[in-house]
């Protein structure tokens, strides 16, 4: 019989009949090693490859370029998949991005983008987005006109300041922009008035730090 093709992403996993959310191994084009990822098979039809997750503040997101490049954390909890992997996955075919958010009052919201991919390392993993919809604000809290990725040791933003140092975490900062899902985790009661928190401006404003976030991608033709 024909040899089974390895899974390129969680959409392949889902279409192979695995419809339970959990950790799966995927084989990304041009990457030497397979990668363990969390697959969300419940939200909006399933098939989502989780590239970022925050939930309890157990993981330090104030890291340098190399760590954001290769990823950190564990797909069973808080993690960043890694820019090199995000670049490789989104180079395979066209992807959409969905971001799930929850505030400390238990309100949930999402932002979805019809097109999502990032540039390679030489392009500072520049963000490319199109077609914003969702409940987390009428306007996009991710920079639509393109922003380079910055970390505490790689200042690629459009500010006279150093956004990643000041606001903590690695992100597609502008000057510094209306979002930072990799900021400091603040617990309930401590999450107001924070410059460097987990921010999604058009959901909860400029200085409210969110409780949980999930960034996930799925092929456009799923």
């Amino acid at each position: 019989r024909e040899e089974e093709k390895p899974f390129r992403d969680c959409a392949d996993v889902y279409q192979a009949g695995f419809n339970k959310s959990g950790i799966y191994t995927i084989y990304i084009n041009n990457m030497p090693e397979p990668k363990k990822v969390f697959c969300n098979m419940d939200v909006n039809g399933g098939g989502w490859t989780v590239i970022q997750h925050r939930e309890d503040g157990s993981l330090d997101f104030q890291r340098g370029w190399k760590e954001y490049k290769m990823g950190f954390g564990n797909p069973s909890g808080e993690y960043w998949l890694g820019n090199e992997f995000i670049f490789a996955i989104t180079s395979q075919r066209q992807y959409m991005l969905r971001i799930e958010l929850m505030d400390w009052e238990g309100n949930r919201a999402y932002s979805q983008y019809d097109r999502f991919h990032i540039g390679n390392e030489k392009q500072n993993y520049r963000l490319y987005l199109k077609g914003h919809t969702g409940t987390a604000g009428k306007q996009s809290s991710l920079i639509l006109h393109g922003a380079d990725f910055s970390t505490k040791d790689a200042d690629n933003d459009n500010c006279m300041c150093k956004c990643a140092l000041m606001l903590t975490g690695g992100w597609w900062f502008d000057a510094c922009g209306p979002s930072n899902l990799n900021g400091m985790f603040y617990t309930a009661g401590q999450n107001h008035g924070k410059l460097n928190g987990i921010k999604w401006h058009y959901f909860k404003g400029p200085s409210y730090s969110l409780r949980s976030t999930t960034m996930m991608i799925r092929p456009l033709d799923f």
Partner: antibody, heavy 122, light 112 residues
């Protein structure tokens, strides 16, 4: 390149009005809070007024409250200061200034206009 | 309003020598979010002010590394490790922790 180009200064009699303008370019104007700061001849800097990125939040210094009105037109990338009931003590160079950070996170003035002199004299 | 007091008000310096300006506030500038909203600006003769230091100790892009800011709460310092001729002008500290924003009186740095 970020630019703030000011216009509208001049000599005016006490009690009269004047409108200052600040044309912005080189950045997404609608994302930034904007300020007016003034400097009387030979004196230090004094904050005058602030308007948030959307125009929904406005503050004034006590010395100009009720007489000055700050406004913005995001479609035209422009900031304004309408000055009514002018007094001799309002004589100063007026600067428009942009917040360092966008989306109403205020950490000071990242960019300044070139300044425009307002002289209130009879 | 918060009163910002700078010293000295006049600072004659020999090129190559260090310089230090103090700024004291009438109330603590340490915000509940952990930041000191204290900036330093330089106004060169005939020019608009320019940002040097933000949030107490962060150098703005393009500012030479001979400039440094330090301090927390009510006491802040701007240091220039080696003064150059182009550093002449009036230096202002400004607080933004408490509304309204207020400036110090300014320190005039001149070359001896």
């Amino acid at each position: 390149e970020v630019q703030l180009v000011q216009s509208g200064g001049g000599v005016v009699q006490p009690g009269r009005s004047l409108r200052l303008s600040c044309a912005a370019s080189g950045f997404t104007f609608s994302s930034y809070g904007m300020h007016w700061v003034r400097q009387a001849p030979g004196k230090g800097l004094e904050w005058v007024s602030y308007i948030s990125s959307s125009g929904s939040t406005i503050y004034y210094a006590d010395s100009v409250k009720g007489r000055f009105t700050i406004s913005r037109d995001n479609a035209k990338n422009s900031l304004y200061l309408q000055m009514n009931s002018l007094r001799a003590e309002d004589t100063a160079v007026y600067y428009c200034a942009r917040d360092l950070l966008d989306y109403d996170i205020w950490t000071g003035y990242g960019y300044w206009g070139q300044g425009t002199l307002v002289t209130v004299s009879s | 309003d918060i009163v910002m007091t700078q010293s000295p008000l006049s600072l004659p310096v020999t090129p190559g020598e260090p310089a230090s300006i103090s700024c004291r506030s009438s109330q603590s500038l340490l915000h509940s979010n952990g930041y000191n909203f204290l900036d330093w600006y330089l106004q060169k003769p005939g020019q608009s002010p320019q940002l040097l230091i933000y949030l107490g100790s962060n150098r703005a892009s393009g500012v030479p590394d001979r400039f440094s800011g330090s301090g927390s709460g009510t006491d802040f310092t701007l240091k220039i490790s080696r003064v150059e001729a182009e550093d002449v002008g009036v230096y202002y500290c400004m607080q933004g922790t408490h509304w309204p924003p207020t400036f110090g009186q300014g320190t005039k740095l001149e070359i001896k």
